[in-house]
């Protein structure tokens, strides 16, 4: 049903859903701090633009009695319960920030007449793609998929002279929320990734993964997995690995690779790490000082959600336009705004664009080095290191199928 919005007469409210079930196990206090820091910035920007208005956030907490798994498994109904609570209290703001679980976002989008914008730090799954009033501020699965297909097809780089058409995907069901949906997208038989590959098999058991590493009859040399180096080590240990195996480790929200004193462990030598290009350091920010790298990205997405709202509010107010309209609800896409850490670009469907970075381990220095970058906005790969010091033969990535010549 339609809920009246606290969103007019110079007073603009943001509804922030503080859900017990969340994409990342982040204390709600940290998210509150991020939102409040964002509000301070927005107020300053509006004031500088000569707009004398009030912007506040209302934090809506669920009671946590029923939906208390803490992860996303029981988030589907929690989101709807919170919406009901908002509806009963007639406390809907101009914008809804909050659901980070794919399940809850999908259900909330489905079961409500959304005449207001929804901003999510998460909602990684393909089922949240192409939603007209949903904006996602952390890289969704679709963006990962497009990179992988682009990289698989690339065959004209000094270090990658074969296009690939095969892959194993390791997915054992214990993944974090982001990894779960990334791998889910790769596994889906109707996804772009599956459509573009000739062969793809999902490995679900540790032993399956371990056996492939030295199996002469393997159907692909490439294995995609998601998680950090420790996750890989737990699985792979110090086992021998065939020389033409390439492991692609998807670890987008981890900037530990970009710490100066980091040395890559020996087990990372046959691994290419896909991560996001780090922004400027957030370590001096009050909300992120005590956060791990992953959680910093999550809190930052909340903060940027507030800044995005401020950006849109400023534009609409300067143009004398009404905020409680479908036009406003549909406007949070195809734009660039000033985020906390620099410009943030949203694509035509409201999903954040970013620069992904593919790292390799230099056999000379045992340090991580950038092999290439990928701009999700233009779906283009840019080689950086034309003569990488790889572990693979001739310092080139091997063919994806052993024994197959150049194509």
């Amino acid at each position: 049903s339609q809920v009246s919005q606290n969103c007019h007469n110079g007073s603009y409210e943001i509804s922030v859903l503080m859900m017990g079930n969340s994409a990342f196990a982040e204390p709600l206090k940290n998210l509150e701090d991020a939102v409040n820091e964002g509000l301070e910035i927005v107020r300053g920007r509006l004031q500088n633009a000569g707009l004398n208005v009030t912007v506040n956030a209302t934090f809506m907490y669920s009671d946590g009695l029923i939906h208390n798994s803490g992860d996303c498994r029981s988030s589907t109904c929690e989101g709807l319960d919170l919406l009901r609570k908002i509806s009963n209290a007639q406390r809907m703001g101009c914008v809804l920030i909050g659901p980070s679980c794919t399940y809850s976002t999908f259900q909330m989008y489905l079961d409500t007449e959304l005449s207001y914008p929804m901003i999510s730090a998460g909602s990684f799954g393909l089922s949240c793609d192409y939603k007209e009033t949903l904006t996602r501020l952390m890289s969704p699965a679709r963006k990962l998929m497009y990179f992988l297909v682009n990289f698989w097809k690339t065959n004209d780089l000094p270090f990658k002279t074969y296009s690939w058409s095969t892959s194993y995907v390791y997915k054992n069901g214990t993944e974090t929320e982001d990894c779960f949906w990334y791998l889910n997208a790769l596994e889906a038989s109707v996804s772009y990734f599956s459509h573009e590959l000739g062969f793809k098999v999902v490995l679900r058991q540790d032993k399956e993964f371990q056996d492939i590493l030295m199996d002469h009859n393997r159907k692909s040399n490439v294995i995609i997995m998601c998680g950090g180096p420790e996750f890989l080590y737990k699985l792979k240990g110090d086992r021998a690995v065939a020389e033409d195996i390439v492991i692609i480790l998807v670890d987008l929200f981890n900037d530990q690779y970009f710490e100066d004193n980091v040395t890559a462990p020996d087990y990372m030598k046959n691994v290419l790490v896909l991560t996001l290009s780090p922004g400027n350091s957030l370590l001096n920010s009050s909300f992120s000082r005590n956060l791990s790298p992953t959680k910093r990205d999550f809190a930052l997405a909340y903060l940027n959600g507030i800044l995005l709202f401020g950006h849109m509010l400023k534009i609409f107010l300067e143009n004398g336009e009404n905020i409680t309209t479908p036009k406003f609800a549909h406007a949070f896409r195809n734009l660039t705004f000033e985020g906390y850490d620099g410009p943030v670009t949203l694509d035509d469907w409201g999903d954040v664009d970013s620069t992904m970075v593919l790292l390799y381990t230099s056999v000379d220095t045992k340090k991580y080095k950038v092999l290439l970058t990928y701009d999700t906005h233009v779906n283009k790969t840019y080689p950086v290191d034309m003569s990488p010091t790889f572990t693979w033969k001739n310092s080139k990535l091997p063919n994806d199928i052993t024994g197959r010549g150049p194509q």
Epitope: F258, E259, D260, V357, Y368, K369, V370, L371, V384, D385
Partner: nanobody
Framework: EVQLVESGGGLVQPGGSLRLSCAAS????????IGWFRQAPGKEREGVIC???????KYADSVKGRFTISRDNSKNTLYLQMNSLRAEDTAVYYC?????????????????WGQGTMVTVSS
């Protein structure tokens, strides 16, 4: 002796492309952070792109999406690929190197500079 030599400049039409090279001698590029700078007539020198020693490119907003940087350690050479060139890109382009204190950040200042190569964008 440490030396940086730029090449590849010239006259190009708006919308066109150029690839500049910066050849290093007397040191290994791989251990250094490298920056491309430019100075337009009557203006101050400005940073265009930096490549940290770890290989992370950092771009000025004015060239993002148009310019890309790469490094070939086997040739000890750095490249600046410039696409969709505009009249305002007209300048002398310099490459500079700095013994890196951080693998992932651009240095505040550079120790070694090349002589520059002129890029003119005009129809």
């Amino acid at each position: 002796e440490v030396q940086l030599v730029e090449s590849g400049g010239g006259l190009v039409q708006p919308g066109g492309s150029l690839r500049l090279s910066c050849a290093a001698s007397g040191f290994t590029l791989d251990d250094y952070a490298i920056g491309w700078f430019r100075q337009a007539p009557g203006k101050e020198r400005e940073g265009v792109i930096c490549l940290t020693s770890g290989g992370l490119p950092k771009y000025a907003d004015s060239v993002k999406g148009r310019f890309t940087i790469s490094r070939d350690n086997s040739k000890n050479t750095l490249y600046l690929q410039m696409n969709s060139l505009r009249a305002e890109d007209t300048a002398v382009y310099y490459c500079a190197a700095s013994g890196a204190t951080s693998r992932w950040n651009c240095p505040p200042q550079y120790d070694h500079w090349g002589q520059g190569t002129m890029v003119t964008v005009s129809s």
